[in-house]
């Protein structure tokens, strides 16, 4: 997250970290069910671990943390590497979470976002770009949803209805390492960090997010079929 600020503790209990061994964070994710996460399809790895209820980036033990294995990862069948359409994936955890003030699911919004909606994006991704500098704790950033026209103008022939753009002033954006993390609007999960320009936070080059309102049926049916 570029030019965000430290999230208040306990305010993002649905935020998950996907880790490669030994403790290398490579993507964010979102708890949407007691045993299921959503993340970006481009975050798929065969071997990874899931950390929930953790505030700092470092692997130091925190009393609220819960660790999991992913037993099943189900990318949306319409995703096409290295493209960006349908960039979402469900991950089934090896057990249900223990609900606490630090670990709690969030509902996926069934309403599509309208331009001007205020949202919050969070993650442990780099705080500088093109340099790489990772934060000590989870970062939060207020962003506004842009109109689909402004989104298409920013990225001609690259935007479809499975994506939406959001941003703020130049210099504020999600970035590498935030992928798969949540965009929360009006208390519901509206999007996942998907892609954007490089370097991040360039003027008139907003962040692009998976438009989850288009996928509520697929999410529900996939969870039911695999529970």
């Amino acid at each position: 997250i570029i030019n965000g600020s430290d999230c208040d503790m306990h305010t993002q209990p649905w935020q998950a970290a996907l880790l490669l061994r030994p403790n290398q964070l490579y993507c964010g994710a979102v708890l949407v069910h007691p045993q299921w996460l959503l993340t970006a399809a481009h975050c798929r790895k065969k071997v990874f671990r899931v950390r929930l209820g953790h505030y700092s980036l470092s692997p130091v033990y925190e009393s609220g943390q819960q660790m999991f294995q992913g037993v099943k990862s189900i990318p949306h069948p319409g995703y096409s590497h290295p493209g960006h359409s349908n960039d979402l994936m469900l991950i089934k955890l090896n057990r249900r979470i223990r609900p606490t003030k630090d670990v709690r699911p969030i509902n996926v919004s069934s309403h599509c976002p309208s331009a001007g909606t205020k949202c919050l994006v969070s993650g442990w991704g780099t705080t500088k770009s093109p340099q790489v500098h990772f934060p000590k704790v989870l970062q939060c950033l207020n962003i506004s949803v842009l109109s689909q026209k402004r989104c298409e103008d920013a990225y001609p022939r690259q935007i479809d209805d499975t994506m939406f753009c959001a941003g703020d002033k130049a210099g504020r954006d999600s970035c590498q390492g935030d992928s798969g993390g949540p965009v929360v609007c009006n208390g519901s999960l509206q999007g996942l960090v998907s892609w954007g320009d490089y370097p991040c936070a360039r003027p008139n080059r907003p962040g692009v997010y998976t438009n989850l309102c288009k996928f509520t049926k697929w999410i529900q049916e996939t969870i039911q079929a695999n529970s």
């Epitope: 065969k46 071997v47 990318p75 949306h76 069948p77 995703y79 096409s80």
Partner: antibody, heavy 117, light 110 residues
Framework: EVQLQESGPGLVKPSGTLSLTCAVS????????MSWVRQPPGKGLEWIGD???????DYASWAKGRVTISQDSSKNQVSLKLSSVTAADTAVYYC???????????WGQGTLVTVSS | AYDMTQSPSSLSASVGDRVTITCQAS??????LAWYQQKPGKAPKLLIY???TLASGVPSRFSGSGSGTDFTLTISSLQPEDFATYYC????????????FGGGTKVEIK
Amino acid sequence: EVQLQESGPGLVKPSGTLSLTCAVSGFPLSNYAMSWVRQPPGKGLEWIGDIYPSDIIDYASWAKGRVTISQDSSKNQVSLKLSSVTAADTAVYYCARDNNDYGLDIWGQGTLVTVSS
Amino acid sequence: AYDMTQSPSSLSASVGDRVTITCQASQSISSWLAWYQQKPGKAPKLLIYLASTLASGVPSRFSGSGSGTDFTLTISSLQPEDFATYYCQQGYTDSNIINTFGGGTKVEIK
């Protein structure tokens, strides 16, 4: 050097159990999923199953109930057991490492197991 | 089931030819497809993963494309060392799968 080496009896009697081990060197099992694949003489590749560092195991549908895959991280080895074998299980058996992007990037040299009385 | 069908099962070609092998999945596997090359008496070798990403050390004459159900392996200019059997493998799911591999395509000298 990253290396995989399968070993086990080359001959197994019908209705017996085929047991193979895959010795892993040059990388820790804790970081990778491992696969077993077989190839009957003159035929194509057949996936048997995968084992993850967390000991989660996925088997081919034909192998469920007959195959057991396990690992010993302290010895850095993976094992395959196939019970109630018949002549149709005669094949070269390979272990392989997944590159974490769903491609098998390191393979053992394979070991031929013949099922015959 | 996610069945993988390769075609052709064999083909004859000359050095320098452009060769195309196809792999079709019975359901969408998104981009989780790998290609392997196998020579007689040897273990398979990974060529391409994620449908189009070239594995380390693989010559650039090999390329992969496709997504969903239809995939292609192309050898832009066939070399003598490329005569072998090629297999595709899906990595989209391991659940209730008979075989993740396609049946293979043997590339022979014309």
